[in-house]
């Protein structure tokens, strides 16, 4: 376990071999989750890229947060996708949080502390527990089958995950840098493996 506070993973160039694999102590399927993270890239007006890829053997797109060029954020649960459009692209560090719950299917998507309109996805579904969680690449199969054209070039950090839906107040607290206790992925006690050309550097966001 490593305390990654104030640090970020840096992916300096396009590749299909560089990634970070995150280890999560999940023992049972997820009926809800929240993922929050920071990232910083110049790619958004150039091409799509993977932000967070959670694959199981049953479904390579179990959870996927992806930037789709000319559209915005693509969010997939269990292979089914919804979009959160972004009309104008700026180059700046971004903080996102997204949550989903099986009981209602409701998805929340927050960008820099601001919520997008709630949407619905995969009501009644459960997310598999035996997962390969990858930063920097999009998994087309469990733990692999990467394409350079979908890789992240830039920085990613503060990746935290919970097995429940955070309240708006809790998400606001996280965005403002307040205290929180993630129970699936914890950036302050991170288990991870680096493959390829990935560097750990001080974070560039406040």
């Amino acid at each position: 376990q490593t305390d990654m506070s104030r640090k970020a993973f840096v992916f300096p160039k396009e590749s299909d071999t560089s990634y970070v694999s995150l280890k999560a102590p999940l023992t049972k399927p997820l009926k809800a989750f929240t993922v929050c993270l920071h990232f910083y890239t110049e790619l958004s007006s150039t091409r799509g890229y993977s932000i967070f890829s959670y694959a199981t053997k049953r479904q390579d797109n179990e959870i996927l947060i992806f930037w789709s060029k000319d559209i915005g954020y693509s969010f997939t649960v269990g292979g089914s996708e919804i979009l959160f459009e972004v009309p104008e692209v700026t180059v700046a560090p971004v903080h996102i949080c997204t949550s989903w719950e099986s009981a209602s299917g409701i998805v929340e998507f927050w960008v820099d502390g601001k919520p997008r309109v709630r949407k619905s996805l995969k009501k009644g579904y459960t997310v598999g527990a035996e997962a390969s969680i990858i930063l920097g690449q999009e998994q087309d199969s469990f733990g692999g089958n990467f394409e350079g054209s979908q890789s992240l070039v830039g920085d990613i950090g503060n990746v935290n995950m919970w097995d429940f839906v955070l309240s708006p107040d809790e998400i606001n607290t996280i965005y403002l840098g307040g205290p929180f206790s993630p129970n699936v992925l914890n950036w302050r006690a991170l288990k991870y493996e680096v493959q390829g050309e990935v560097f750990t550097k001080p974070q560039l966001w406040p």
């Epitope: 797109n61 949407k119 619905s120 009501k123």
Partner: nanobody, 117 residues
């Protein structure tokens, strides 16, 4: 076995409208989005849009807003695309595909549309 079966070729006059279909089988229809793609002769693929049969969401790429209308029927596991105000520029092969904006794993065989007077 997953299959996407598309309707047959269409020959229509300029200014008319057309509907083409894509019948899905071999999986739960509401589990995946259905995308529609245009391939003009000798040109690269153009993404038209997609429909999410689970929640009813539709998304249209810029060039096809107002040109295409995407619908579906859950009970028959069929997706439809209507194209309006047709011109010769709309002559192409149109494909449906299952998947996401990131990746599409199964494709229909294509429907050829010819717009000619």
């Amino acid at each position: 076995e997953v299959q996407l079966q598309q309707s047959g070729p269409e020959l229509v006059k300029p200014g008319a409208s057309v509907r083409m279909s894509c019948k899905a089988s071999g999986y739960t229809f509401t589990d995946y989005n259905i995308h529609w793609v245009k391939q003009s002769h000798g040109e690269s693929l153009e993404w038209i849009g997609f429909v999410n049969p689970d929640n009813g969401d539709t998304y249209y790429y810029k060039n096809f807003k107002g040109k295409a209308t995407l619908t579906f029927n859950r009970s028959s596991s069929t997706a439809y695309m209507d194209l309006r105000s047709l011109t010769s520029e709309d002559s192409a092969v149109y494909y449906c595909a299952r998947g996401t904006t990131v990746e599409k794993d199964y494709w229909g065989q294509g429907t050829t549309l010819t717009v000619s007077s």
